[in-house]
């Protein structure tokens, strides 16, 4: 999916008002310095591509983020403010129902959500030069 035509300001507002708080809740009890940010993004569409990938694609050691509250809200924001995104999710939603897993918070998941926090922060500062 190409995130170029999303309503970035509305997605940003949703992040600031609610998604960011859910990410913080998920990470509660973890020091902010505990994980190094290894995933980066260069512009808003790229950031959303990386955010989608880390949030919804199961990875080794962390297969359970998609049912978290921040993930549900991310999915809603993309479906509402990214033209045509909801259509791409119709088959994906049906597939996810089949492979739904028990929610487990592993260290790998905490690391992944830490990366997500960094990607979202970058998404909110699109004019900053890449470090």
């Amino acid at each position: 999916y190409d995130f170029t035509n999303c309503d970035f300001e509305k997605i940003k507002a949703a992040y600031l008002s609610t998604i960011s708080k859910d990410l913080i809740t998920y990470m509660s009890g973890t020091k902010s310095t505990e994980f190094n940010n290894t995933v980066s993004c260069s512009n808003r569409p790229h950031c959303l591509t990386e955010i989608q990938s880390l949030t919804f694609n199961p990875t080794a050691g962390c297969a359970s983020l998609a049912k978290e509250m921040f993930a549900m809200k991310t999915k809603a924001a993309l479906a509402i403010w990214c033209p045509g995104y909801s259509e791409t999710q119709i088959n994906a939603t049906q597939a996810m129902k089949k492979r739904r897993k028990r929610k487990v918070t592993t260290n790998k998941c905490l690391e992944q959500v830490s990366q997500l926090q960094g990607l979202w922060r970058r998404f909110n500062r699109p004019l900053l030069k890449q470090q």
Epitope: D7, A14, K75, A76, A79, I80, W81, G84, E87, T93
Partner: antibody, heavy 120, light 107 residues
Framework: QVQLVQSGPEVKKPGSSVKVSCKAS????????MHWVRQRPGQDLEWMGT????????DYNQNFKGRATITADKSTSTAYMELSSLRSEDTAVYYC?????????????WGQGTLVTVSS | EIVLTQSPGTLSLSPGERATLSCRAS??????VHWYQQKPGEAPRLLIY???QSISGIPDRFSGSGSGTDFTLTISRLESEDFAVYYC?????????FGRGTKVEIK
């Protein structure tokens, strides 16, 4: 089963406001956005805007920006649409319709409609 | 704003005949089109979503096809209860828009 029950008909004077309610039951309120669509007599359907309980935010058709306010009370699973500065051309049936925001993504259930008549 | 143009405006057919309704979008909207049926004094009822996805409880004589800008709703054999107005709607982007409707009437 899923039900959207709207408030009763209203007769309003030009320049006044109207607030229509839509009480939802039979599903998890925050899993769906609530859209508002109006239909003027003998006319087609016109999307007014939506409230997304999961994100606690609303979005509007620019044609109604500033005149329409869409809100919801999550504790009672009730959505509201307020339209101000009413004029005769706002005489219409106003519908609420739910739309999944993390699945289905379509207006699959509608309220029965609320007739708002604007007349001096 | 995406404009949806429905044709024909009115379709006069007899029960048992096949109805083919068209909806054309002013720009590419992939498959983000949904079809509704509306009878006088009633709210619209969802028939088909995302161009061709069927809805449980909707008779299988209703089917949809198309992508990009051209979409079709087909009623394979008209029943008496099918005479109504049919609307297409796009959810590709805000503001969501509806076509002006096709009235299917008894010939």
């Amino acid at each position: 089963q899923v039900q959207l029950v709207q408030s009763g008909p209203e007769v309003k004077k030009p320049g006044s406001s109207v607030k229509v309610s839509c009480k939802a039951s039979g599903y998890i309120f925050t899993d769906y956005a609530m859209h508002w669509v109006r239909q003027r007599p003998g006319q087609d359907l016109e999307w007014m805007g939506t409230f997304i309980p999961l994100l606690d935010t609303s979005d509007y058709n620019q044609n109604f920006k500033g005149r329409a306010t869409i809100t919801a009370d999550k504790s009672t699973s009730t959505a509201y649409m307020e339209l101000s500065s009413l004029r005769s051309e706002d005489t219409a049936v106003y519908y609420c319709a739910r739309m999944g925001v993390t699945h289905s993504y379509v207006m699959d259930a509608w309220g029965q409609g609320t007739l708002v008549t604007v007349s001096s | 704003e995406i404009v949806l143009t429905q044709s024909p405006g009115t379709l006069s057919l007899s029960p048992g005949e096949r109805a083919t309704l068209s909806c054309r979008a002013s720009q590419h909207i992939s498959r983000s089109v949904h079809w509704y049926q509306q009878k006088p004094g009633e709210a619209p009822r969802l028939l088909i979503y995302f161009a061709s996805q069927s809805i449980s409880g909707i008779p299988d004589r209703f089917s949809g096809s198309g992508s990009g800008t051209d979409f079709t709703l087909t009623i394979s054999r008209l029943e008496s209860e099918d005479f109504a107005v049919y609307y297409c709607q796009q959810s590709y982007s805000f503001p969501y828009t509806f076509g002006r409707g096709t009235k299917v009437e008894i010939k």
